[in-house]
């Protein structure tokens, strides 16, 4: 039960995280105009990964896309790449994790396969989260560097008579969305990896032996009446619907830690 909960929660947390990464990537407010020097501006600037916008106090907003690839700073290109890689990995991870969910039954998929898929999606979520956190952090670092550079420029080379205030940019909402979303995706990925350990059947040195009675095609499982542990185990004389589960006497024998010769 705990494994299913951990896996399910990991999936949900990752889903929210990836939705957040997508939202952050699309948002225009990666950097917003610093209003420290001019809190009563009638023109407010903000920039995203794909376009820059100007909001006038008249209520009109004008956005212009960055229609060049070669003219953009390498750092911005790197941030874009990190965010896109994060989204792609996260999306693939979500797809894989859907099939890996314990509560979803697809054909006769074994627990070992589900465990592998859970681990794969978990790793994908972790890398996706790290990509998003890295992308946002690179952009934040770029902002901090530019902020102090423009601050230095503001107080040097001033004509004395005329103020030529340079527009400075500070952290926008998208950065915080990106950090939180990346963190959630990372946490979700870790949870999936933890769930994988609980899903994986433990290796044993003993194999189950089937005894076939002549004239009967019934498989007898030694220790069949012994209460077994783990998820999906059936209790004696109880019929449980589990996508084709059978009563204890009908179950074919598979290697299990309770199988002794």
């Amino acid at each position: 039960m705990a494994v299913t909960a951990c896996q399910g929660l990991g999936f949900v947390v990752s889903l929210i995280g990836i939705a957040g990464i997508i939202a952050a990537t699309c948002m225009d407010q990666w950097s917003t105009q610093d209003l420290y020097n001019n809190p009563v501006t009638a023109v407010f600037n903000y920039q995203g990964l794909w376009r820059s916008c100007v909001r006038e106090s008249s209520g009109f907003t004008e956005c212009r896309g960055y229609f060049t690839l070669l003219g953009l700073p390498a750092m911005l290109q790197a941030v874009r790449a990190l965010m896109i890689v994060g989204i792609v990995l996260g999306a693939i991870g979500l797809l894989v994790s859907i099939f890996a969910l314990k509560c979803i039954r697809i054909g006769s998929m074994e627990d070992s396969a589900k465990a592998n898929m859970t681990l794969t999606s978990g790793i994908m979520f972790i890398v996706s989260g790290l990509c998003a956190i890295a992308g946002v952090s690179v952009f934040a670092n770029m902002l901090v560097t530019n902020f102090w550079m423009s601050t230095a420029n503001m107080y040097t080379g001033m004509g004395g008579m005329v103020q030529t205030v340079q527009t400075r940019y500070t952290f926008g909402a998208a950065l915080f969305v990106g950090w939180v979303a990346g963190g959630l995706t990372l946490i979700g990925g870790v949870m999936m990896c933890i769930a994988c350990r609980g899903l994986a059947p433990e290796e044993t040195n003993y194999k189950a032996v089937s005894y076939h009675a002549s004239g009967h095609s019934v498989a007898y499982k030694p220790g069949g009446f012994k209460a077994s542990t783990g998820f999906g185990s059936n209790t004696k004389n109880k019929k449980i619907y589990d996508g084709g589960a059978r009563t204890e006497d009908e179950v074919q024998s598979y290697p299990s830690k309770h199988d002794y010769v």
């Epitope: 105009q33 001019n38 009563v40 501006t41 009638a42 023109v43 600037n45 903000y46 920039q47 820059s52 916008c53 100007v54 006038e56 106090s57 008249s58 209520g59 009109f60 004008e62 212009r64 005329v162 103020q163 030529t164 205030v165 340079q166 527009t167």
Partner: antibody, heavy 118, light 113 residues
Framework: QVHLQQSGAELVRPGSSVKISCKAS????????MNWVRQRPGQGLEWIGQ????????KYSGKFNSKDTLTADKSSNTAYMQLNSLTSEDSAVYFC???????????WGQGTSVTVSS | DIVLTQSPSSLTVTAGEKVTMSCKSS????????????LTWYQQKSGQPPKLLIY???TRESGVPDRFTGSGSGTDFTLTISSVQAEDLAVYYC?????????FGVGTKLELK
């Protein structure tokens, strides 16, 4: 066609108050800021403040902040400016003007003359 | 507050003459985000409300004759009337649209000889 119709001229006593109106037509009144501008006789233009009829948000020039009150009535598409504690210094023509793209005042009312005299 | 200084305060011209008037700002009106100068020019004829002529320092409002041209960037701006007509006699104001409070220049009065 955008049109701003202001109320008629006012002759008031010093110390009293007056409320002048600006009725808008031909556009979505709630979606645009409305500015108020003062022009004393033979003088230039002075920005008083502005109101956003959609939510009643206001911005004032420092020198007019405590004296004037801007309001708007969405149902009648009318903006109002109340001038309080009037003195002879407040004798002027008051204009309302719509705030538009580019932070410009694109349409103006015809002006309301306020004369403060005892 | 941004102070706009207009010069000259008055101009006496003859019809057909080219006229230029200046507006200087105490701070830049150039917005880095869209590279637009938030300076507007208005024309006010006697007994009338002001009329919008030019916005963003150089963009002519629709319906304004092309003899009116705005130029300049940052802190120095100019309004040019290529060939003055009798109907151009008015007071011309520049306005800051970049920062609150919104401010106007004192105006330049255009008169005929």
């Amino acid at each position: 066609q955008v049109h701003l119709q202001q109320s008629g001229a006012e002759l008031v006593r010093p110390g009293s108050s007056v409320k002048i109106s600006c009725k808008a037509s031909g556009y979505a009144f709630s979606n645009y800021w409305m500015n108020w501008v003062r022009q004393r006789p033979g003088q230039g233009l002075e920005w008083i403040g502005q109101i956003y009829p959609g939510n009643g948000d206001t911005k004032y020039s420092g020198k007019f902040n405590s004296k004037d009150t801007l309001t708007a009535d969405k149902s009648s598409n009318t903006a109002y400016m109340q001038l309080n504690s009037l003195t002879s210094e407040d004798s002027a023509v008051y204009f309302c003007a719509r705030f538009y793209y580019g932070n410009v005042m694109d349409y103006w009312g015809q002006g309301t003359s306020v004369t403060v005299s005892s | 507050d941004i102070v706009l200084t207009q010069s000259p305060s008055s101009l006496t011209v003859t019809a057909g003459e080219k006229v230029t008037m200046s507006c200087k700002s105490s701070q830049t009106l150039l917005n880095g985000g869209n590279q637009k100068n938030y300076l507007t020019w208005y024309q006010q004829k006697s007994g009338q409300p002001p009329k919008l002529l030019i916005y963003w320092a150089s963009t002519r409002e629709s319906g304004v004759p092309d003899r009116f041209t705005g130029s300049g960037s940052g802190t120095d701006f100019t309004l040019t009337i290529s060939s003055v007509q009798a109907e151009d006699l008015a007071v011309y104001y520049c306005q800051n649209g970049y920062s609150y409070p919104l401010t106007f220049g004192v105006g330049t009065k255009l008169e005929l000889k």
